[in-house]
Each structure stands twice: as structure tokens, then as C-alpha cells.
Amino acid sequence: DSSKWNIEHPGTIYAWEGACVWVPCTYRVLDGALETFILFHNPEYNQNMSKFEGTRLYESTKDGKVPSGQKRVQFLGNKINNNCTLSIHPVHVNDSGQLGLRMVSKTEKWMERIHLNVSERPFPPRIQLPPKLQESQEVTLTCLLNFSCYGYQIQLQWLLEGVPMRQAAVTSTSLSTKSVFTRSELKFSPQWSHHGKIVTCELHDVDGKVLSEDMVQLNVKHTPKLTIEVTPNETIVRKGDSVTMTCKVNSSNPEYTTVSWLKDGIPLKEQNTLMLTLHEVTKSQTGRYCCRVSNDVGPATSEKVFLQVQYAPEPSRVQISQSPAVEGSEVNFLCISPANPLPTNYTWYHNGKEVQGRTEKQFQIQKILPWHAGTYSCEAENILGIGERGPGTELDVQYPPKKVTMVIENPTPIREGDTVTLSCNYSSSNPIVNHYEWRPRGAWEEPSLGVLKIQNIGWNNTAVACAACNNWCSWASPVTLNVLYAPRGVRVRKIKPLSEIHSGNSVSLQCDFSSSHPKEVQFFWEKNGSLLGKESQLNFDSISPEDAGSYSCWVNNSIGQTASKAWTLEVLYAPRRLRVSMSQGNQVMEGKTATLTCESDANPPVYSYAWFDWNNQSLPYSGRMLRLEPVKVQHSGAYWCQGTNRVGKGHSPLITLTVYYSPQTIGRR
């Protein structure tokens, strides 16, 4: 009953003459233990006898005997662990067929058949490839041999085009009830160059002898492999030459589908064949060329060919580091003239005239000066010829106004109060002068550019300077105007005495002035309209009060005369010319009022008066007027007065007062 038995084994075992077989086998019986195990070769069931007949290779009996001549068969199993593994070593071709495993338990019987396939010669392994091989994509190559036996050592070796492959292969074996095999796995990154190449897996015995092999041809899918050829084979060509570039497809799997050409990475229009012809090349065709070819795997780009189109220098142009340039600055000139090969020699021109000794691309002027201005041009030369000289570049050299001078336009001499016209001149300037500056600054009129009009010129306008200005101001040396004017600052100054003037003093007055142009002057002294002298000093040996008064001095030069302010000369003197006056006359009737006044001439005025009688007796009066009221006859007599100021005293002569009796008094008498 098959349901009672469960036997596991590979089903078919492969081997070859002289090798061995190892048959992994396990069993399970549902009812009881295995009692008898017989290994048949090609068993056949005899219906009549109800038993299996055939060559017995092994029989497990009580003593476990093996039939004679079958020492090569070994039962490796045991009843304890349900193992029915067996081996035949060596194995022969005539062992091919069925191995019958007759198993008997107490109650059940079973015949298990295992196919044994023993070939005359070792059979080849099988190479297994993935469905698609693509360049540079790693894959695993498998070499599988449905054989493995503990008693027979084998080796699998990989070869590419007959040469052992360097990559390390991983070999594994399986001796299980599921499968028996030896397998070698190789990790491999196919390159385009492997396409069409033969990979071999060789089966070797323990001595390294090749027993069998399997071969496959690699079908490596890859982008087109390209090389580029140039004819003529020189990539340096001259302008006007023709050049052909050929894109060679050395390999492509699958076949290429499209072709294009690129210059400096940019596709060329309508160029889709493997040949690119450039007729009469121009300098613009200089560049890096490559072809791009695509197949189903992808596009491929060839290496770049650098095509250099040589040409004579093109018309030049001059680049100037700065224009306008400021005088004294550094200026660099650069000759720009595209050429291939680069120019080896340059010729420079200034205003059309060749500049000696300058043969390089750059021409430098360390300190630019006005005469360096003009047009600069250049010629460049290479092996193909001399380039055309371009129109040139203009250098403008800017500088402050030069040689600035001032001119007085007036007829000389200039007098104070005149209108003076000055002009500011210069020899050259770049850019043009656009304004002028004047020193000192004044509210003066500039009737036109560079002309200054000073109206009513002051005596003290001594020097004037002008500047002519463009981007910079250049100053002229100041011009002295030499303004002529009448003496100024005329005044009277007392030289002596140092203190106040007293009558009798020696007195000196000085006529001073602050300035005069011209310097030559004359002096005049005047008192109350009368001319006193013509010296700078006015002297009094002994001053008298009559000399007091208002004095002026005049100073004149050829331009005019100037008077000082009137100066008051004050003479101090003691009271003098004292006299007593009586308003009512010197005869007065008794009972009336007699008024005596002390009159005096004094400087400063009298501040104190004293009165005396004929006996020189001081009277008790201190005022200027002596008032007797009512006057008596006894008052008759002579009187005098004395006046005092801070200079001194003075007294009057006697004056007689006569007091007569009134008619009443006479009448009483």
C-alpha cells in the first residue's frame, strides 16, 4: 500500500563509466520498522510467483550479506534513522537502468524504483546564462553538472576564448534527496569586446584531466563602438582646405539605427551619415568634432577630434586700457587680431607712423604725455602672413590747463575806484577750459569766460590770481594790481607833552597816515582855515591859550589829498584877566543892591572864588558874585576878587564902590 510508505530520493541519478553514484535516500513506513532491504538491478515482478526477480546488488539480512561480486555496492543507511542511502563505486555503463529498493516491514512490502543513467563518457555540464547580457551590467554565469559523488572528486573550470577566467568562481555541491549536482557560479561584467566570444565550462577530474565541457557564445548587447578618422590625417588644416571625417562603427549589438555629428557638443544639421565632409573650411569650423551613433541599447559618442583651422591674422583692432587717459597715468595698448597659430610678431603704429622697438601684443606707456595722444593701430603676423591693419583706436590724453597767466587789460596806472579788467590765459588744455576761478573771491563781474571786471577797485586789492579749469584747475601766479590811492588813515597825534597841555609847555603834533600809494607825500597844517605849516610835525615852543583851537592836517600824494578829522588843542592855564564888574555901575545909593561879579579867563574854569576888601580883609563870600543888599554907605571902598582852578590862582585889580546917601538920609540931616 503506497500510502504506508514515504521514500525520498532524487529520482534519477546520472554518472559515467568508472565514476561512482551516491544515492541519497530516506524512508518512512507507517506501520512498524523495516526488516528487510534488497537492492535489485532492473527488477521485474513475477506474477506467477508473486515476487520480484532480478540481479540482487545488496541484501540486508540478519548478517547483512552482500551478494558475491558486488563489493562495489554499499548500503549506507540504517534502520534506526530511516536512511536508505547507498553508493556504487565504481559504476559501469551496464549499471544503467532501474535500481529497485525492495523494502519489507512486519506487515507491509514496497518496491521503490530509482533511475540510474551511466554514460560511456563523462557527460558535459550545462552553462546557464541570463536571458540578456548587456555591457558593464554584472551577471552570474552558472555551470551545472547533474553529478556528485563522495568517492569521485571533480572540478568545474571557466574559460573565455580558451583562457581561464580570472574571476573567482563559487562551486557548490548538492547530495540531497531532492537533487544531486555540482554547480559553479561566476560573477561577470561582460564588456562589448566579449560579444561573440566563447565561454567554456570544463569538467576536470582529480588529476586535472578534462572529462567534458560545455560552450556558449556570448551575445553582449552594447552601444556602438566608434573610432573617428580624418583625411587628410592632419587635424591642423589651413583655411580653404577640405576635410573628411569618417565615423567607423567597430562593433554594435544590435545594429546601429541613427548617426549624427556634433561640433563643440552641438549637433550639426543634416549630417546623418558615417562620413562628414567639410569643404573650404573657415576659422569658425575650428572645434571639437565627434560622431554619435545609436542602437537599441543607447547612444555612443566617439572620441573628439580637435580640428584647428589655421588662418592669417584677421584685421586688427587696438584695445586701450583707458581713454581718455590722464597725463602721467599708465596706459596699456592691446593688439587684438584673431589668428591661428597665434601671431609671433606685432608692428605698432602711432598716427600711421611705425613705432620702433615694439613687437609684442601689448604696448605699454608708463607715464602718458599729451603728445602720446592720437590713433594707435597694429599689424599682427603669423606663419600664414601679415594681417590687415585695422582703423586704429583713438587715445585722448587729458591734462590740466598749461601755462596759465593773468593779464591786466587796463592802461596803467590803476587808481582806487577805477574799473579794472583782468584776463586769464592758458596755452593748452584737454578737455577745454569750462570755468575759471579767481582769488580773492569777490562780488565781481565776469563779463565773459576768463575775463574779470572789478568795478570801483579798492585801495587794498593788491594781488589777484586766476585758475583756468577743466577737470582740474591750474593757477596762475598772482598778479599785483599796484592800485594807486590817496593817503589813508590821516590823523593828528600829539607827541608831547605826554600829559595835558599847560600854558607855556613845548608842544609837538604829528600828522600820521596809515598808507599811501605812491609813497611820496606832502603835509599841510591848518587852524581855522589858516595854513600853519608843511611838515609832518607842528611844534609850539611855548604854548599859549591863544594857540588852543581846532587843528587839521592834510596829506597829499599825486593821486589826491586827505584831511584828518579836526583835532582840538586845549591849553590849560591858571585864571587870568580877572576883573570885578558892577552891573549897576560903581556908584550906588544906599539901600539899593550892589552886585559885584568876578569875571575871569581860565581853563579849566574857576571852581573857587574869594573876595577881599581894601584892607585885604577876606569877605565871607565864595561865589562868583558878591551881592550887597541893602548896600550901606559904610560899604564904600575898594574890592578885589581871587579865582582858583586846578592850574593856579589869579586876582583882579581893585575896583572902587561908592555908596552915597539917599535923599531921605540927606533930608533927615
Partner: antibody, heavy 122, light 107 residues
Framework: QVQLQQSGAEQVKPGASVKMSCKAS????????IEWMKQNHGESLDWIGN????????EYNEKFKGKATLTVEKSSNTVFLELSRLTSDDSAVYYC???????????????WGTGTTVTVSS | DIVMTQSQKFMSTTVGDRVSITCKAG??????VAWYQQKPGQSPKLLIY???TRYIGVPERFTGSGSGTDFTLTITNMQSEDLADYFC?????????FGTGTKLELK
């Protein structure tokens, strides 16, 4: 034609100073700098310095700073070289040379003066 | 300062000879080299500038060559009036410097 006429030979005592002249003619004086060279007894030449008559700009070889002073007198188209604190090492022929129209300090010299011989001896 | 070395102080020659006077610069001076001729009692005269350009009026037998540090003045078909001192000068760097000179003498 372009000429640079130099003053005559000088015999001077150590410690003294000497001032030699170089008068230009045959070209616009203010458009070219004037360079000065020293030559010892027919041997190598030494560049002393230069002056530009246009703006009195001077430039000296470090070696001659403090020894040489260059001045110009535009009215007479003349450049002067004054050497001070003279020693026997200053005995040489001194040449004035016309410099570059484009004012380059890097130049070669096509117009040379007649030379002034200076002898320093006590 | 750039040193200009004229290793031969004196050179003996005969009329008709080809003479090469050398000058070595202490550092690269490109082609900024001039050659001068000086006869006894005279001022130097410019022969060559820019290493190889002949100055106006200079006979064709005088040629200059070289660049960088090595320069040569060649006189083909030497004449008796060529007996003189020859100086090289660099004008590539400041200050300008001259060679020590080479004197041509008759053998």
C-alpha cells in the same frame, strides 16, 4: 640732425661737486626723456637715471641716489647732472642719452651724447 | 638687478671671419636686448634692438639672435672697421643693465 652736446672734461678734488651739462638739438626737447650713463675706463656701462624735460620727472638707479642730481633748463634745451661728495670711484665718462618718445623706462638707446670725462684726484 | 654676462672679454679674429659674441642674462628677459658697438674715444652706437632687429643704417653683416637668457651678436664677413668693444643691454627689468663688454682684436 639730432645731437646731444656735452660739456668739457672736469678735473675735481675729492669731496667736491661737479655739474656737467648736455645740450639737445635737432628735435623737440620736451618730448623725450634724457638718460644718463656712467662708463668706467672703457668698461661696462651703468644706468644712473633719467629726467623728463616736459615735467622735470626724475627716476634714479638706487645705486646713484644721493650721489646724482638731475635738473633741466628748458629755455636752453639743456639737462644737467650734478655729482656730489666725489671720490676716485666717480672718475668715469658720463654720457647723456636720448630716451624713449613713449616715455618707457624699459628701452634701448639710439642717440648718445659726446661724453664728459670726470677725473677725481687730489 | 639682472646681471648680463659676456664671458669673453677679448676675442681674436681676422678680416672675413664669422664672429659670434655671446651674452647671458641672469634671468628671462624675453627679447628685450640691445647690442652696442663702441670704438675707442667714441660714444656707443646702437646696432641691434629687440634681440634681432637691426637699427637703421647698420650693415647687414650684423645679426642678433636669441631669447630668454641666451643672446648672440654675429658678424659675418668681419671687417677691420668692426674692431671695437661690443656691449649687450637688457631693458626687460628695472634698472637697465649692460654686459661687461667683449673686445674684438686682430689675430
Amino acid at each position: 640732425q639730432v645731437q646731444l652736446q656735452q660739456s668739457g672734461a672736469e678735473q675735481v678734488k675729492p669731496g667736491a661737486s661737479v655739474k656737467m651739462s648736455c645740450k639737445a638739438s635737432g628735435y623737440t626737447f620736451t618730448t623725450y626723456p634724457i638718460e644718463w650713463m656712467k662708463q668706467n675706463h672703457g668698461e661696462s656701462l651703468d644706468w644712473i637715471g633719467n629726467i623728463h624735460p616736459y615735467n622735470d620727472d626724475t627716476e634714479y638707479n638706487e645705486k646713484f641716489k644721493g650721489k646724482a642730481t638731475l635738473t633741466v633748463e628748458k629755455s636752453s634745451n639743456t639737462v644737467f647732472l650734478e655729482l656730489s661728495r666725489l671720490t676716485s670711484d666717480d672718475s668715469a665718462v658720463y654720457y647723456c642719452v636720448r630716451g624713449d618718445y613713449y616715455n618707457s623706462r624699459y628701452w634701448y638707446f639710439d642717440v648718445w651724447g659726446t661724453g664728459t670725462t670726470v677725473t677725481v684726484s687730489s | 638687478d639682472i646681471v648680463m654676462t659676456q664671458s669673453q672679454k677679448f676675442m681674436s679674429t681676422t678680416v672675413g671671419d664669422r664672429v659670434s659674441i655671446t651674452c647671458k642674462a641672469g634671468q628671462n628677459v624675453r627679447t628685450a636686448v640691445a647690442w652696442y658697438q663702441q670704438k675707442p674715444g667714441q660714444s656707443p652706437k646702437l646696432l641691434i634692438y629687440s634681440a634681432s632687429t637691426r637699427y637703421i643704417g647698420v650693415p647687414e653683416r650684423f645679426t642678433g639672435s636669441g631669447s630668454g637668457t641666451d643672446f648672440t651678436l654675429t658678424i659675418t664677413n668681419m671687417q677691420s672697421e668692426d674692431l671695437a668693444d661690443y656691449f649687450c643691454q637688457q631693458y626687460s627689468s628695472f634698472p637697465l643693465t649692460f654686459g661687461t663688454g667683449t673686445k674684438l682684436e686682430l689675430k
